[in-house]
């Protein structure tokens, strides 16, 4: 059979080889398509409800005014010329529809390095056959389930037109220290060969590098955190991230009811101020990061260095 590819909605003419160019003709067309359950016979004398789908032209060709999905199948013509010689024509018809240009929707403007991020959802509407969506990073194909790349796909079919809508959601984990402005794009590849891919406009989210935990530095003055009764301790939380995050303070794992500040001053230290202190840096777009904990203790006169253990208290510090 000769393979014919026709675009949905377009007309199609199938020639009946060996048929006399004008009536009277001895020919019949047989079709086995999505509109038939076995073979449907159409003849030149026909004319009827099938004409909206397929009709025999005066020259014996079969005319399909607007090819549809249900017209996929086999078309055969059997013709006899004036001398009684029989000729058969056999066609296998496949149909296609190219969708509109795919689009990336719900795209992220910023990604966080080191954690999974949704980049966006690629949508293609109105294809047949379904075809496929694929993602590209800086022009190179992204392979799902490799290097922190995952893709969630969904295919829906329109109940009336039979055309497909494809959706593909891309999740990536950008490497730390990688490209700060990667370029993502998505392309639709048709299900039938010989049709080029359609590509979306690219998106270029920023990659934000979160401050690693060890970079939230807690500096204690005096060093070591041991101080004589009535002395002063200054705790400074240093975060190199920009913009500066909010700094909250914890004592013995419990948040201190103080407004955010990078510096905590404990004046006139008493037993109630002893304990384990840490700071928590909270970035507007990211989760909290806690510093190492330091122990603040009171040195009784005649002691060297910090005492072992600490007593929790309810004393509050002063913010600088």
């Amino acid at each position: 059979a000769q393979n014919i590819t026709a675009r949905i909605g377009e007309p199609l003419v199938l020639k009946c080889k060996g048929a006399p160019k004008k009536p009277p003709q001895r020919l019949e067309w047989k079709l086995n398509t999505g509109r038939t359950e076995a073979w449907k016979v159409l003849s030149p004398q026909g004319g009827g409800p099938w004409d909206s789908v397929a009709r025999v032209l005066p020259n014996g060709s079969l005319f399909l005014p607007a090819v549809g999905i249900q017209d996929e199948g086999i078309f055969r013509c059997q013709a006899m010329n004036r001398n009684g010689k029989e000729t058969k024509s056999n066609y296998r018809v496949r149909v296609y529809q190219i969708p509109g240009k795919p689009e990336i929707v719900d795209s992220a403007s910023e990604l966080t390095a080191g954690v999974p991020n949704k980049v966006g959802t690629c949508v293609s509407e109105g294809s047949y056959p379904a075809g496929t969506l694929s993602w590209h990073l800086d022009g190179k194909p992204l392979v799902p389930n490799e290097k922190g790349v995952s893709v969630k796909e969904q295919t829906r079919r329109h109940p009336e037109t039979g055309l497909f809508t494809l959706q593909s959601e891309l999740m990536v984990t950008p490497a730390r220290g990688g490209d700060p402005r990667p370029t993502f794009s998505c392309s639709f590849s048709p299900g039938l060969p010989r049709h080029r891919a359609l590509r979306t406009a690219p998106i270029q989210p920023r990659v934000w590098e979160p401050v690693p935990l060890e970079e939230v530095q807690l500096v204690v003055e005096p060093e070591g955190g041991a101080v004589a009764p009535g002395g002063t301790v200054t705790l400074t939380c240093e975060v190199p991230a920009q913009p500066s995050p909010q700094i909250h303070w914890m004592k013995d794992g419990v948040p201190l009811p103080l407004p955010p500040s990078p510096v905590l001053i404990l004046p006139e230290i008493g037993p109630q101020d002893q304990g384990t202190y840490s700071c928590v840096a909270t970035h507007s777009s990211h989760g909290p990061q806690e510093s190492r904990a330091v122990s603040i203790s009171i040195i009784e006169p005649g002691e060297e260095g910090p005492t072992a253990g600490s007593v929790g208290g309810s004393g509050l510090g002063t913010l600088a």
Epitope: R35, T36, E37, A38, K40, G47, G48, P49, W50, D51, S52, V53
Partner: antibody
Framework: EVQLVESGGGLVQPGGSLRLSCAAS????????MTWVRQAPGKGLEWVAS????????YYPDSVKDRFTISRDNAKNSLYLQMNSLRAEDTAVYYC????????????WGQGTLVTVSS | DIQMTQSPSSLSASVGDRVTITCRAS??????VNWFQQKPGKAPRRLIY???NLADGVPSRFSGSRSGTDFTLTISSLQPEDFATYYC?????????FGGGTKVEIK
């Protein structure tokens, strides 16, 4: 909402003529074949004529061929049935219906208009 | 021409009954059969299209089936508003042919 409204029915003498109209709304008229169906008093349904969406091709049963002519004006969303040489047996309610091909069958009908052929 | 032989021509039934109406085509018409309901003085209303598909807005108690050239309309549980005349139509070939109708009456 699909609406089909017939008009033009009435009393006519045998041998006379009548023109029925059907005004269509609520759908893209030129995308559909259209059909006339009739029903004699107390009887069943009988196909009268069909026309394709462009108006280029028309179809009739032998009972009305050469006497009735179906036509359409896509600009006016209107369907017509010109009936000539009317006979007593043409007395019926005439319905306009959307469709008539294998894609649609007949899906929406008008309320009908009565044609009486009598002397 | 194709003949559509519809049976029975009339039947009496009660509310809640299961009702079956059949049309037999004189030759293969594929799936190209519609079923209609008509009440006195009203236009026909399509119930089933392409032999087995329920038209929009039609209650699910109506169903259509096909076996070769035999087509069946079934009403699973007859309701008071279902008392009417029912017609089949083949639209595979011209002339389009209707069945003779089945009048469903109250027993």
């Amino acid at each position: 909402e699909v609406q089909l409204v017939e008009s033009g029915g009435g009393l006519v003498q045998p041998g006379g003529s009548l023109r029925l109209s059907c005004a269509a709304s609520g759908f893209t008229f030129n995308n559909y074949w259209m059909t006339w169906v009739r029903q004699a008093p107390g009887k069943g349904l009988e196909w009268v004529a069909s026309i394709d969406n462009s108006g280029d091709n028309t179809y009739y049963p032998d009972s009305v061929k050469d006497r009735f002519t179906i036509s359409r004006d896509n600009a006016k969303n209107s369907l017509y049935l010109q009936m000539n040489s009317l006979r007593a047996e043409d007395t019926a309610v005439y319905y306009c219906a959307r469709g008539g091909d294998i894609v649609v069958g007949l899906d929406h009908w008008g309320q009908g208009t009565l044609v009486t052929v009598s002397s | 021409d194709i003949q559509m032989t519809q049976s029975p021509s009339s039947l009496s039934a009660s509310v809640g009954d299961r009702v079956t109406i059949t049309c037999r085509a004189s030759q293969d018409v594929g799936i190209y059969v519609n079923w209609f309901q008509q009440k006195p003085g009203k236009a026909p209303r399509r119930l089933i299209y392409r032999a087995t598909n329920l038209a929009d807005g039609v209650p699910s108690r109506f169903s259509g089936s096909r076996s070769g050239t035999d087509f069946t309309l079934t009403i699973s549980s007859l309701q008071p508003e279902d008392f009417a005349t029912y017609y089949c139509l083949e639209f595979d070939e011209h002339p389009l042919t209707f069945g003779g109708g089945t009048k469903v009456e109250i027993k």
